[in-house]
């Protein structure tokens, strides 16, 4: 557990007036319907609110927007909906923020059946001020920004036609026809599907992937029989149909599609899916479906190319296509994750993994917890996490689990105690140390959000009444103070605070409701006269995260190097500031045999650090595809964990050798790919 | 120990609407838990009608689907049943009934003592 | 929807005899997802079995249950007279529907 100093909760002092004089009011002139808020940047304080109400009429449905502008943070609010001509704007699309601190927004206006095409409301101000732009076509999804560039914009129309522009949306060019799925990658490279036949559902499995680098001047197909693609960090996947039946493949590139190699994972059928849990440029985590309706399937973790897969993890519940897993990258500490299985017993049971999937273990039991009515053994349980699937089947879990990668090794989330996840109502939990040791921190569900990075961490009661206490910690949720932020209680709809954990601002969101009418309105509380001076370098602690055994002189050693980070003190009550860059001080480990992957061909017995061969490949040539050739593989089973900095120790022994012969099973091979240019 | 007591009215008209309450004692709904009804027609087996979780999520049978409503009432620690346009074939001792504790599961370990209701003009 | 259809009817056997009860399943169901029920005339029906096999709070031993799959089965060892009773199994699988099997009548010979 990380230090917590002062077990002893000292009250914050005078901490009602001085939130009462950071407490701002705001409530809006509007019917109740459905609000949406977006941050505008980083650190600028710039809000936009559309708030809209749908009045079903016998005929049509008539709809009304307004439009709302805030710069400090939601203390104050501006209408500025004639700056869009007092349009209705389409919720479905949302507002389109630019990356990065662009200020660039893009709103999507409804119109009338019998328009030519759509109308975009453009500002690159931060909203101050708003273009109208008549489009050329209906947009199908929101606009997407080129992450490289914010003036370039693409658009699936409902026509499947791939829009594009190159000057945020001014002037518009349809590059292609008969589209499907559209992404951006790297340097302003777009990545589409199209159909020949009749439609995206009437050729799936018979797609064409292609490729445009200069926004639709020149086109490559690098792949025929997709069934569907993705991008995951340098990873580019896609799903391929097998020659003569009705499985697919995984098949990756990590060259946008020049080269491919065929995946060492299992294929799929028909009603089977595979889904990219997590990536990054180190390594993927790939969810394959289990054949049947069973809501699981199995994860695997890849090597450094995302071509060999280990097996990671059996069981993980994934209900169905699109549908829910729990799988949860905890972000405040390096190598962590959270996710769900489902056991033998059908029962769901939440795993961790510290080392980037190379073992899962259950959650320790909270001290301050008793194990519930799932308990066969009312001394021996374990904490189960609500995530995704909880929230699905519409338990009373008001929030997934919480985690910010500047307030170091935090997690908060809602969970029971037991042997499995239980349809009890939750309690929530936190854990200071990455997940290793959890402590109830409140009793029943609560909305509950970071501030200040860690400094500050603020919970509301989820109730089916009106609300009007707020609670806050400012050590970690050990303590917790109460403040009445209104006389009069509102209907709470949610928590927001600005991207990134680094503001001291909190926006309450709700509704009132009188005889007549009912309004938004919302609180913000700033925290800054709580936490009244800057934190020194007395008010931090040198904490060594993973840190199991400190007798061990490879303690803390995760992926071949152990980090300390400077973290605040429990009883420190200082602000971080907006500018608070985590400390951190890795140095490497030796290596050891936690520091390799089995190999293809190669597996883990359980509670075993060596890898041995799978029974059925013993005696056979390791032999699989690599862009479109054979490779021999010479290993004694082991691989370097993706984004492990190990040295020294323990050096298993690995040849590839190119055996020259082209693979008959890779289906994206460089003979099947042409270009062409517009 | 948590106890289930149905009640309602015995006798329902056809085309009306049948209703019926099991307030629960000993465990307060709102802890969680699914809640559910069963029915049982005179000498034959067990048919699950739905279930209710304590927020209001609820779960039924296809086959009734369309004339079921279960809701829950936290404040009484109640939940309820509405069955419309009955007929005949929904004469049947009614059972209400807690769920197990684990999500995902939904055989019944604590039961009502039932309550017969008729169908008849 | 998954059918259940538990046999025989109705089994004559004698006190301190062992009993055992079929329940098939129209298709597969987990095992974990099967459970059975005593009712004796007049009363609400009792957990006896959940998860094909586990034994509910304060079951007597003599009851188990097996199978998986398509076929699952209820033993009763050695029949005491207050086990004469009828007995169902239910499936709950992921999905509602949730089933139950028409019944087996376990009386005195």
């Known amino acids: 557990s990380a230090p917590g100093e002062d077990e002893e909760c000292g009250r914050v002092r005078d901490f009602v007036a001085k939130l009462a004089n950071n407490t701002h009011q705001h409530v809006f002139d509007d019917l109740r319907g459905s609000v949406s808020l977006s941050w505008v940047g980083d650190s600028t304080g710039v809000i936009l609110v559309l708030t809209t109400f749908h009045v079903p009429l016998v005929i049509m449905t008539f709809g009304q927007s307004k439009l709302y502008r805030s710069e400090d943070y939601g203390k104050n609010f501006k209408d500025i909906t004639d700056l869009i001509n007092n349009t209705f704007i389409r919720t479905e699309f949302g507002m389109a923020i630019g990356p990065e601190n662009s200020g660039k927004v893009v709103l999507t206006a409804e119109v009338s059946g019998g328009s030519r095409g759509g109308r975009i409301f453009r500002s690159s101000d931060f909203a101050k001020n708003f273009v109208q732009t008549d489009l050329p076509f209906h947009p199908l999804t929101q606009m997407m920004y080129s992450p490289q560039n914010s003036d370039y914009l693409l658009a699936l129309s409902t026509e499947n036609g791939l829009w594009v522009s190159k000057n945020f949306g001014g002037k518009w060019e349809e590059i292609h026809k008969a589209v499907c799925l559209a992404k951006w990658g790297s340097d302003n490279t777009i990545f589409f599907t199209t159909y020949a036949n009749g439609s995206c559902k009437a050729d799936l499995g018979a797609l064409e992937l292609w490729r445009t680098s200069d926004l639709g001047k020149s086109f490559k197909t690098i792949g025929v029989k997709i069934y569907s693609f993705g991008l995951g960090g340098r990873f580019l996947f896609a799903s391929v149909m097998a020659d003569k039946d009705t499985t697919r493949r995984i098949h990756v590139s990590t060259d946008q599609g020049d080269t491919w190699s065929m995946a060492q994972l299992p294929s799929v059928g028909q009603e089977q899916f595979y889904s990219i849990l997590a990536a990054n440029d180190d390594m993927v985590f790939m969810h394959v479906d289990e054949p049947g309706d069973t809501g699981f399937g199995t994860i695997f973790t890849s090597d450094d190319r995302g071509i060999v897969y280990s097996k990671s993890l059996d069981r993980h519940l994934y209900t169905t296509t699109g549908g829910e897993t729990d799988f949860t990258n905890v972000t405040s500490l390096r190598g962590v994750y959270i996710t769900s299985v489902l056991s033998e017993d059908n029962s769901i049971q939440t795993m961790i993994t510290f080392d980037q999937g190379g073992r899962w273990t259950h959650l320790r039991k909270p001290e301050n917890s008793e194990c519930d009515a799932t308990a066969k053994n009312k001394n021996e349980c374990s904490l189960h996490i609500h995530a995704s699937y909880s929230i699905s089947q519409k338990l009373n879990v008001p929030m997934a689990p919480l985690s910010e990668p500047n307030a170091v090794g935090i997690v908060i989330a809602h969970g029971s105690v037991g042997d499995a996840i239980s349809v009890m109502v939750p309690d929530v939990y936190i854990s200071d140390d990455g997940g290793y040791s959890w402590t109830k921190m409140l009793e029943g569900p609560h909305y509950y959000t970071i501030l200040d990075s860690g400094g500050i961490i603020v919970a509301i009661e989820h109730s089916s009444r009106p609300i009007n206490v707020i609670k806050f910690s400012t050590d970690e949720g050990q303590c917790w103070q109460t403040y009445t932020f209104t006389r009069d209680p509102i209907y709470f709809t949610g928590l927001a605070s600005e991207p990134g954990a680094r503001s001291m601002n909190i926006s309450i969101w709700g509704f009132t409701e009188s005889f007549l009418t009912s309004q938004w309105v919302s609180y913000t509380i700033d925290f800054k006269d709580i936490l009244e001076r800057n934190c020194e370098e007395k008010d931090y602690t040198i904490w060594l995260a993973h840190s199991t055994d400190p007798e061990d002189y490879e303690d803390g050693c995760i992926l071949g190097y152990k980090e300390q980070f400077l973290r605040l003190r429990k009883s420190s009550v200082c602000q971080n500031g907006r500018d608070y860059v985590v400390t951190k001080q890795p140095s490497i480990c030796l290596c050891s045999l936690e520091d390799f992957l089995c190999d293809f061909g190669y597996y883990r017995p359980e509670n075993d650090s060596k890898c041995v061969e799978q029974p059925e490949l013993k005696g056979h040539d390791l032999e699989f595809c690599l862009y479109g050739r054979e490779e021999h593989l010479t290993t004694n089973g082991y691989r370097k964990i993706p984004g492990d900095k190990c040295q020294g120790g323990v050096n298993p022994v690995r040849e590839v050798k190119d055996l020259k012969k082209k693979c008959t099973s890779n289906f994206l091979s460089p003979e099947k790919q042409n270009s062409k240019s517009n | 120990q948590v106890q289930l007591q149905e009640s309602g009215p015995g006798l329902v008209k056809p085309s009306e609407t049948l209703s019926l309450t099991c307030a629960v004692s000993?465990?307060?709904?709102?802890?969680?838990?699914?809640w559910g009804w069963i029915r049982q027609p005179p000498g034959k087996g067990l048919e699950w009608i739905g279930s209710?979780?304590?927020?209001?999520?609820?779960y039924y049978n296809p086959s009734l689907k369309s004339r079921v409503t279960i809701s829950v009432d936290t404040s009484k620690n109640q939940f309820s049943l509405k069955l419309s346009s009955v007929t005949a074939a929904d004469t049947a001792v009614y059972y209400c009934?807690?769920?197990?504790?684990?999500?995902?599961?939904?055989?019944?370990?604590?039961w009502g003592q039932g309550t017969l209701v008729t169908v008849s003009s | 929807e998954i059918v259940l259809t538990q046999s025989p009817g109705t089994l004559s056997l004698s006190p301190g005899e062992r009993a055992t009860l079929s329940c098939r399943a129209s298709?597969?169901?987990?095992?974990?997802?099967l459970a059975w029920y005593q009712q004796k005339p007049g009363q609400a029906p009792r957990l006896l079995i959940y998860?094909?096999?586990s034994r509910a709070t304060g079951i007597p031993d003599r009851f188990s249950g097996s199978g998986s799959g398509t076929d699952f089965t209820l033993t009763i060892s050695r029949l005491e007279p207050e086990d004469f009773a009828v007995y169902y199994c239910?499936?709950?699988?992921?999905?509602?529907?949730?089933?139950f099997g028409g019944g087996t009548k376990v009386e005195i010979k």
């Open positions: 298709q597969s169901v987990s095992s974990s997802y």
């Open positions: 209710i979780y304590h927020s209001g999520n609820t």
């Open positions: 009934a807690r769920g197990p504790p684990e999500l995902g599961k939904m055989y019944f370990q604590h």
């Open positions: 239910q499936q709950h699988g992921r999905l509602p529907p949730w089933t």
């Open positions: 998860g094909a096999s």
């Open positions: 000993g465990y307060s709904i709102s802890s969680g838990y699914y």
